[in-house]
């Protein structure tokens, strides 16, 4: 039996009597015979060659067709040459007829010949003579006929003898199906062939265990009328953690992984990573090593860098310049940046607190790509510790102790801080009297204050200055009816402080002696 055939009847496979219906009973006879290999089998023989007009029918038992539509009938038979039978030339024939009758159930033992549909007249390609009998040359003829499409649940086959000397050695009834196969990691189930010789049945495959359909490429095959699968379309691919082995998806072994179904094969775990179970889609990082969220699974696990090297500093009053060399170990990454941590420390116990937000960093405090920074606006005569930490993409994932280079310094004299609380005390046509408060941080002895003023319309293109040692002053020789801008800064031995915010004051008009309040307008600080 070829793999693509599903047997509905095989007379050779039956050890007991077939007990088919013979009509008349003196016609076809069931006897034990031999097949082509001289194996005993049940055969039906008829050799009614003496009388003319033979009409001997042999009918099989009812054959359920299952879900078949096209049925094949294979007959193996031997036919004796009429010339080997003396004296019967007028009555002996060398053909027989094959019929079928469709029905939904077993109709009993009566053969109603008129209901049967003729399939074909069967003739032998080879008949054998008396001489062949002696040599045991039982010449076996094989004929295959097709019936269908069938519409009922089953059918009978019938053989009509019209006067031949014949032995039915084998009757095989089958239909063809495409047997379940695995192709492109898809299982295609047993599929019965179509009802027509040229028909193709499209079948959708189901992915094998641990496989999935390739995107927008569902696996399909066509089952041909001959029971053969035709060229596959689409495919399944092994899921993450699995790779193809023959017709199956096998899990990646330990120390291997496959992160995507698109990858063909499992890969060895990248450096500093491992998988201690089968079927891994990614490898876990070793202790102390990490994978950044943006790192693809195929890159090595990395660790935070070591501390920057050769940290040096330069102090200029309340400004510190820091410079360093890259870390000896970048942790296996090339995204190293630096961040600066500033701590202000007390003189006594050496306790330190973060510097706060009023400190300036140039170019920036974190995310430094270059290996230098300038820290500004420090307090004068204060102790500071600066920690320079090298950072990479996995530093924030690490729970281990930070690695940094540190330096402790003491700042020198600093310029005073900004003057505050500038007020106009009196405004006249040609003079304005101002007062202010001492800076919050004088950073030494204030030697004088410098007042800068200019007509607002001039936008500082030309300005005048006036110096005073006190915290008030009268500015004279102004134009009546004009808006002036005033800014004040403190001066110490260490230098100039920053100017106070701008204060706009309008002098009185000449015609009127009336005083009025000018509105103070503060603006951004002007640099020295």
């Amino acid at each position: 039996q070829a793999a693509k055939e599903v047997l509905l009847l095989d007379s050779k496979a039956q050890q007991t009597e077939l007990e088919w219906i013979s009509s008349p009973p003196s016609g076809w006879e069931e006897i034990s015979g031999l097949d082509e290999n001289y194996t005993p089998i049940r055969t039906y023989q008829v050799c009614q060659v003496m009388e003319p007009n033979q009409n001997n029918w042999l009918r099989t038992n009812w054959i359920s067709k299952g879900n078949a539509q096209r049925i094949f009938v294979e007959l193996k038979f031997t036919l004796r040459d009429c010339n080997s039978l003396p004296g019967v030339l007028g009555t002996c024939k060398e053909t027989f007829n094959l019929y079928y009758y469709e029905t939904d159930y077993d109709t009993g033992r009566n053969i109603r010949e008129n209901l049967y549909v003729k399939i074909d007249t069967i003739a032998a390609d080879e008949s054998f003579t008396q001489g062949d009998l002696g040599e045991r040359k039982m010449k076996l003829n094989t004929e295959v006929r097709e019936i269908g499409p069938l519409s009922k649940k089953g059918f009978y086959l019938a053989f009509q003898d019209v006067g031949a000397c014949i032995a039915l050695v084998s009757v095989k009834v089958y239909y063809k199906k495409c047997w379940s196969i695995v192709e492109n990691l898809a299982v295609f189930p047993d599929t019965v062939t179509g009802s027509e010789f040229s028909s193709l049945v499209e079948v959708r495959g189901t992915c094998v265990s641990s496989a999935e359909e390739e995107a927008e490429n569902s696996p399909r095959m066509h089952c041909s009328a001959e029971g053969e699968w035709l060229v596959p379309i689409g495919k399944c691919i092994c899921k993450a953690g699995y790779q193809q082995k023959g017709d199956t998806c096998e899990p990646c072994g330990r120390r291997f992984y496959k992160s995507s179904s698109q990858d063909l094969q499992c890969s060895r775990c990248p450096t500093h990573s491992f998988s201690d179970r089968e079927g891994s889609s990614r490898c876990e990082c070793e202790d102390g090593y990490y994978r950044a969220p943006s790192d693809p699974p195929y890159v090595a696990c990395t660790r935070p860098p070591s501390a920057p090297q050769n940290l040096i500093f330069n102090i200029n009053q309340t400004t510190v310049s820091l410079e360093w060399s890259p870390p000896a170990d970048n942790g296996g990454r090339n995204d190293v940046t630096y961040r600066i941590l500033c701590k202000r420390c007390s003189w006594e116990q050496g306790e330190c607190v973060p510097c706060g937000s009023n400190i300036g960093y140039m170019p920036q405090q974190t995310g430094l790509e270059d290996n230098y920074v300038t820290v500004m606006d420090l307090l004068a005569h204060a102790n500071y510790t600066f920690e320079v930490e090298a950072v990479n993409g996995v530093s924030d994932l690490s729970r281990s102790q930070r690695l940094f280079a540190a330096v402790s310094i003491t700042t020198g004299q600093a310029a005073p801080s900004q003057v505050s609380g500038v007020m106009k005390e009196r405004v006249l046509q040609r003079s304005v009297q101002l007062s202010w408060q001492e800076p919050e941080h004088p950073n030494g002895v204030i030697t004088e204050y410098e007042i800068k003023y200019y007509e607002k319309d001039q936008r500082e293109r030309t300005y005048s200055t006036l110096k005073t040692k006190s915290t008030s002053a009268s500015i004279n020789n102004l134009k009546p009816g004009t808006v002036y801008v005033f800014q004040i800064r403190a001066v110490t031995a260490a230098g100039y402080g920053n100017y106070s915010p701008r204060l706009d004051v309008a002098t009185l008009e000449e015609a009127s002696g009336k005083m009025f309040e000018a509105t103070a307008v503060s603006s951004e600080q002007n640099p020295v």
């Epitope: 031999l34 023989q45 050799c47 009614q48 007028g90 009555t91 002696g134 045991r136 039982m138």
Partner: antibody, heavy 121, light 106 residues
């Protein structure tokens, strides 16, 4: 039940004739050929020939003389063996036997009980 | 004319034993012989025809084989009712019998 019924023993003088009947029953007489076999006392079997019961066409064994004639009466399903000019050496049991043709070979599957013909002066 | 020679003429066996009867043709025959059994006072009985087909009602201890000129009838285990004379017969254009083998009780 298929049967071949033959007549009882016959005693004949040399030169006489005898006609041995063989009546068939239990099957269609004309569907099978009929063969004749004789067995001399204490001897083996000797095939004499056969007749096509449908056409009446006889086939005689090689070396057979014209003294043996096979005939039929299909109306009574009977075959006959007639021996003329009997000789002492014709003394034997005469059997009719139905011929069985098959695809794979032939044989005589049903035998009459035999008719003993004795030729004696 | 083809002559069939059977041997031995007499075969003595005990019940239950195997009996092997030979039939040799004077020339290669065109068919395998049929085999017959004949008991005293009875008509012959067809045992085997068509090379190896047992006739209706014949037990399967009887089997036949051979080709060309040498043929054999085997009784695998002789039963008491098997003691008889056995004839081979070839069927061609002219049918002939062997002279017979007598199987007797040892």
């Amino acid at each position: 039940q298929v049967q071949l019924l033959q007549s009882g023993a016959e005693v004949k003088k040399p030169g006489a004739s005898v006609k041995v009947p063989c009546k068939a029953s239990g099957y269609t007489f004309t569907s099978r050929a009929m063969s004749w076999v004789r067995q001399a006392p204490g001897q083996g079997l000797e095939w004499m020939g056969w007749i096509n019961t449908n056409t009446g066409n006889p086939t005689y064994a090689q070396g057979s003389t014209g003294r043996f004639v096979f005939s039929l009466d299909t109306s009574v399903s009977t075959a006959y063996l007639q021996i003329s000019s009997l000789k002492a050496e014709d003394t034997a049991v005469y059997y009719c036997a139905r011929v069985r043709f098959t695809v794979y070979g032939d044989g005589m599957d049903v035998w009459g009980q035999g008719t003993l013909v004795t030729v004696s002066s | 004319e083809i002559v069939l020679t059977q041997s031995p003429a007499t075969l003595s066996v005990s019940p239950g034993e195997r009996a092997t009867l030979s039939c040799r043709a004077s020339q290669s025959v065109s068919s395998n012989p049929a085999w017959y059994q004949q008991k005293p006072g009875q008509a012959p009985r067809l045992l085997i025809y068509g090379a190896s087909t047992r006739a209706t009602g014949i037990p399967d201890r009887f089997s036949a084989s051979g080709s060309g000129t040498d043929f054999t009838l085997t009784i695998s285990r002789v039963e008491p009712e098997d003691f008889a004379v056995y004839y081979c017969q070839q069927y061609g254009p002219s049918w002939t019998f062997g002279q017979g083998t007598k199987v007797e009780i040892k």
